[in-house]
C-alpha cells in the first residue's frame, strides 16, 4: 500500500532572467527512493539516481542545475518557462509518487512591484 505523500513548493512565481528552486519532499513512507525525475510537460529535465547521481538533459544543461538535495534549480528564466513541473519519485517497494509545481515567470517590472498579488 502506498502511504507516502509529496509536499511541494506549490504555486510559485519568479522574475524573468532570474532563477528558482523547485523542491519536493516525500514523507510518511519507509520506501527507498531509487530515482527522482524532474519533468516539464512532456520533457524530462533531469534525473537523480540514488546509485549514479545527477544527470541533466543535454538540452537543458546550460539552464538547469542539480539540487539543493533532490530539488532542481532553473536559471536564466524566460516567460516560456511558465507552466507545470513534476517531481516523480520512483520508490521501492511503493512505486511512483508524483508532485506538481506551477511556476509563473513574470516580467521584471511586474515582479518588482508585486502588482499581480495586490488585494483590492
Amino acid at each position: 500500500m502506498m502511504t507516502g505523500t509529496i509536499e511541494t513548493t506549490g504555486n510559485i512565481s519568479a522574475e524573468k532572467g532570474g532563477s528558482i528552486i523547485l523542491q519536493c519532499h516525500l514523507s510518511s513512507t519507509t520506501a527507498q527512493v531509487t530515482q527522482v525525475n524532474w519533468e516539464q510537460q512532456d520533457q524530462l529535465l533531469a534525473i537523480c539516481n540514488a546509485d549514479l547521481g545527477w544527470h541533466i538533459s543535454p538540452s537543458f544543461k546550460d539552464r538547469v542545475a542539480p539540487g539543493p538535495g533532490l530539488g532542481l534549480t532553473l536559471q536564466s528564466l524566460t516567460v516560456n518557462d511558465t507552466g507545470e513541473y513534476f517531481c516523480i519519485y520512483h520508490t521501492y517497494p511503493d512505486g511512483t509518487y508524483t508532485g506538481r509545481i506551477f511556476l509563473e515567470v513574470l516580467e521584471s517590472s511586474v515582479a518588482e512591484h508585486g502588482a499581480r498579488f495586490q488585494i483590492p
Epitope: 530515482q35 525525475n37 519533468e39 546509485d51 549514479l52 547521481g53 541533466i56 538533459s57
Partner: antibody, heavy 117, light 107 residues
C-alpha cells in the same frame, strides 16, 4: 577521438566466470557512465548494468544481481564487467558503451562470449 | 520493468521512400527515448536521443518524435546504407530497456 576498446573473445565452460574489459580514451573517464549491454543470438539488445566511474556507484538489472559485478579503474580509464555462474544462455556479444544521460553515445566493438561444455 | 514494444518487426521500403518505425512504452517515459541503428558485425550507433534530438553527425533524413508512451522514428528518404536493425530504448528509468528491433530492408 572517443574510443572504447574491449578485450577479446572468450570461450568458457558452464559454471565458470568471465571478465570483460573496456578501455576508454579521448574523454574524461569520470565524467560519463559506462554501461554494459549484451545481445544473444537472435535476441534484442539487453541492458545489464552501469557504473559511474567517478563515484563508483553501480546499478544492475535485477535478473543479473548477484551474478554480475561492474567495476572501474580510474587510473587506467578501464571498466570491467564480470559475469559468474555462466550458462549456455549467456552466450552473447557483450558491449560496453559510454552513457550520456542514460543513452549510449559511443560503443565498444563488442566481445563475443561463448559458453559451451 | 518498462517494456518497449516496437512495430513492425520488419519493413521493406523502396529507395527514396519513407520508412516509419513505432515504439510503445508500457508506461510513461516522458521524452526519455533513444533510437539506435545496428548493422551486422558492427556496434550500435546512436541516432536520436530525448525522443527528437538528432545526435551529432546523423543525417537529417532521420527524425524522431513522440512523448509519454508513443514514439516514432522516421527515415524520410531511405538510402541503401540505411539497411539495418533499428532499436528504441527508454532512458527514463533503470533498467534501461530496449525494444525488440525493426529490420529495415530495401524493397
Amino acid at each position: 577521438e572517443v574510443q572504447l576498446v574491449q578485450s577479446g573473445a572468450e570461450v568458457k565452460k558452464p559454471g565458470a566466470s568471465v571478465k570483460v574489459s573496456c578501455k576508454a580514451s579521448g574523454y574524461a573517464f569520470t565524467n560519463y557512465l559506462i554501461e554494459w549491454v549484451r545481445q544473444a543470438p537472435g535476441q534484442r539488445l539487453e541492458w545489464m548494468g552501469v557504473i559511474n566511474p567517478g563515484s563508483g556507484g553501480t546499478n544492475y538489472k535485477e535478473k543479473f544481481k548477484g551474478r554480475v559485478t561492474i567495476t572501474a579503474d580510474k587510473s587506467s580509464s578501464t571498466a570491467y564487467m564480470e559475469l559468474s555462474s555462466l550458462r549456455s544462455e549467456d552466450t552473447a556479444v557483450y558491449y560496453c558503451a559510454r552513457g550520456e544521460y542514460f543513452f549510449f553515445d559511443y560503443w565498444g566493438q563488442g566481445t563475443t562470449v561463448t559458453v559451451s561444455s | 520493468d518498462i517494456v518497449m514494444t516496437q512495430s513492425p518487426d520488419s519493413l521493406a521500403v523502396s529507395l527514396g521512400e519513407r520508412a516509419t518505425i513505432n515504439c510503445k512504452a508500457s508506461q510513461h517515459v516522458s521524452d526519455g527515448v533513444a533510437w539506435y541503428q545496428h548493422k551486422p558485425g558492427q556496434s550500435p550507433k546512436l541516432l536520436i536521443y530525448s525522443a527528437s534530438y538528432r545526435y551529432t553527425g546523423v543525417p537529417d533524413r532521420f527524425s524522431g518524435s513522440g512523448s509519454g508512451t508513443d514514439f516514432t522514428l522516421t527515415i524520410s528518404s531511405l538510402q541503401a546504407e540505411d539497411v539495418a536493425v533499428y532499436y528504441c530504448q527508454q532512458h527514463y528509468n533503470t533498467p534501461h530497456t530496449f525494444g525488440g528491433g525493426t529490420k529495415v530492408e530495401i524493397k
